[in-house]
Amino acid sequence: MAQGAVIHVAPEQPTHAVCVVGTATPLDVRGSAPKGYTTFGITASPGVIVDVIHGPPVKKSTMGASKWPLDPELEVTLQVKAASSRTDDEKVRVSYYGPKTSPVQALIYITGVELSLSADVTRTGRVKPAQAGKDQSTWTWGPGGRGAILLVNCDKEDPQASGMDFEDDKILDNKDLQDMSPMTLSTKTPKDFFEKYQLVLEVPKAKMNRVRVFRATRGKLPSRYKVALGPQQFSYCLELPGGQHSTDFYVEGLAFPDADFKGLIPLTISLLDKSNPELPEALVFQDSVTFRVAPWIMTPNTQPPQEVYVCRVSDNEDFLKSLATLTKKAKCKLTVCPEEENIDDQWMQDEMEIGYIQAPHKTLPVVFDSPRDRGLKDFPVKRVMGPNFGYVTRKLYMSELTGLDAFGNLEVSPPVTVRGKEYPLGRILIGNSGYSSSESRDMHQALQDFLSAQQVQAPVRLFSDWLFVGHVDEFLSFVPARDKQGFRLLLSSPRACYQLFQELQSQGHGEATLFEGLKRKRQTINEILSNKKLRDQNAYVESCIDWNRAVLKRELGLAEGDIIDIPQLFKLAGNSRGNSKAQAFFPNMVNMLVLGKYLGIPKPFGPIIDGHCCLEEEVRSHLEPLGLHCTFINDFYTYHVYNGEVHCGTNVRRKPFTFKWWHMVP
């Protein structure tokens, strides 16, 4: 809230004070009242509004002037109607009265000034002049919320630059400016005002490394923008002329919300009285605008796709062809990382997660680069980040990382309502260990902290450490549905697979084989159903998926009807530590690419019955009634045998939500 310094009244000698238009300035009439005086009267020139907060006046004089008792509860405030054209051009007279004494007069000369710091606190995408009396220092969530929003300026307008735009203290061009939030300081004062007064813009020292403020000066680009505040500077003295003046600032975020930073940055303008060189500057007035750094937001499968990313590796030409056809049907762009840039690392999903940041005036896609640094490590920096495409990462030591820090282990649900609480941007899903042991793997705490700190997609922790690779995308996916719920959760289900195979066996198809057309040992339905070891392993897997099913139902507010079981078998294999972990027995169909109504599903090579793969037909029977088109893509030798599938090998940039994150209440 804007605050003016208390004006102390000095009887028998004039007081000089500054009042800011729109701010009620306290006037202390009681503290300096001469001894023996019990009441007072007050008059002011027409440009000053006097407000006395008290009971009714003790006495009204015949002249119409009122008298008030000098009680402890007394509060007197002054407001100026407009800025003064000359210093001291408004007057307030206080008259003190006592039962046995003659009246004593105190005279206050007031200079009215206009002084306001404006930002887009109403979230319209435009800076409107600050409304008098409206608090700009608190930031509130919700549709009626107020408070300015700041973007981390994390894109790279100059493709030749070495880093992100916020990593230097220059403004490149107007495009760079658009990534920043404008703020205006408006002043209207007498001509000689700033000979005795000083304006200072400041940011709390603890937050100076999270923000940079540029001041626009008259001149040519780009030198007309000077750094006012930032990591090296927490306060900035403004040299301003008197009269009416407007100073434009541009504010850029330097850091995303995180464990040690809630995302709020107050910028404060202080008016200091420096009229007496013998004394320290006195604080006359202060106003603040609080900005919140826009969170990084993930997009679920239900959002329309805009661009698909995939790697070219040796022998995946046929896979690329299928993917090209799928992306063309879905009308989204296809970006292929060439072999020389991925160094045999085809796991595009694990390398990055593409989300976005949004302010009322600008929306920017932002790639979150996983700390998993393999062959694709330069792809997000070199090929994704660029003009109007931001970048964020959390660097961790390789020794601290596990396979669960790759972003196949980072998903997000569609919007949900859980026991009356709305999550209009969905909830982040990450995989961890079910219980801690010396062998257990979890997503690194620094990543979990970052995701939680964004506040708008409260994370749900799932159990994924039972898997060999350990990613949530190995047992779940979401697909859009043309109904009220708008989506279905797909879960891998050994139970559904055994049921299907038993049914087919009872219909006389027991000799139908899996893996037909592949250079590997074919297995019949009969062999699979009679394999006790495989059954036991899948009973264990089912229990792990059931655990997650319960968590998902509870944390996403889902009913059984919102879940589709996708037939899938797993097998256990020893990992490097000798622990048994689950791998897909045949290509893992839930690990699919969702491009609107077009699905790219790993071809399962299931038993062929009447010329059709029974696993494909089963999946079609669940998904096609939802208006979805299933394309089964052969990823067997290029992805499946390396413990990944279509989803692991691809990535998608999706359309941001139409819902504005600031309208929610976390």
Partner: antibody
Framework: EVQLQQPGAELVKPGASVKLSCKAS????????IHWVKQRPGRGLEWIGR????????KYNEKFRTKATLTVDKPSSTAYMQLSSLKSEDSAVYFC???????????WGQGTTLTVSS | DIVLTQSPASLAVSLGQRATISCKAS??????????MNWYQQKPGQPPKLLIY???NLESGIPARFSGSGSGTDFTLNIHPVEEEDAATYYC?????????FGGGTKLEIK
Amino acid sequence: EVQLQQPGAELVKPGASVKLSCKASDHTFTTYWIHWVKQRPGRGLEWIGRIGPNSGGSKYNEKFRTKATLTVDKPSSTAYMQLSSLKSEDSAVYFCAFSNYLDYLDYWGQGTTLTVSS
Amino acid sequence: DIVLTQSPASLAVSLGQRATISCKASQSVDHDGEGYMNWYQQKPGQPPKLLIYAASNLESGIPARFSGSGSGTDFTLNIHPVEEEDAATYYCQQINEDPYTFGGGTKLEIK
């Protein structure tokens, strides 16, 4: 959408080489696959080969492997096809075609008419 | 190489009627349940223009009177109702196997 500029005609002597160009208007040049197609009067269309984004993934029709060499120059957003040891049967219209999706030829140049004659 | 045989070599169709062009491949051009057959239209002095991709998918901006069907080795392009501006040569092209090959073309004349 991308526009492809090809020179209208080239006249070359037998035995010589020629480098045909195809300039793209689009700055996202490096996201396209560039295909070359030959058309002789009354002989239909023949696919020569393609070169992938960032010069990756070249693929040739075996019939043209010794005849054509595909390259790209990223700074100028230009694709080239060099044809060597030219004979009269190399006289044809040569089209460049760009694809966003590997092998679906979305955008075509107007073609360069190559005449091999002494 | 996969040989594509188009028929008829030419046909004349009355305005508003249906034009049907067939393309037979010497071997299947299917992959992952998709027929990798495309159809192009070429008018004199112009480059070819993609009409239909992956057997049956209409390219963006192409009128809905063009449709494609088929799988394996047999594919069809239909134009209905035929309009004046459809007079052109139509080519099928397979992209399932190297080298990608084109059919010999079908010249459509409007009566």
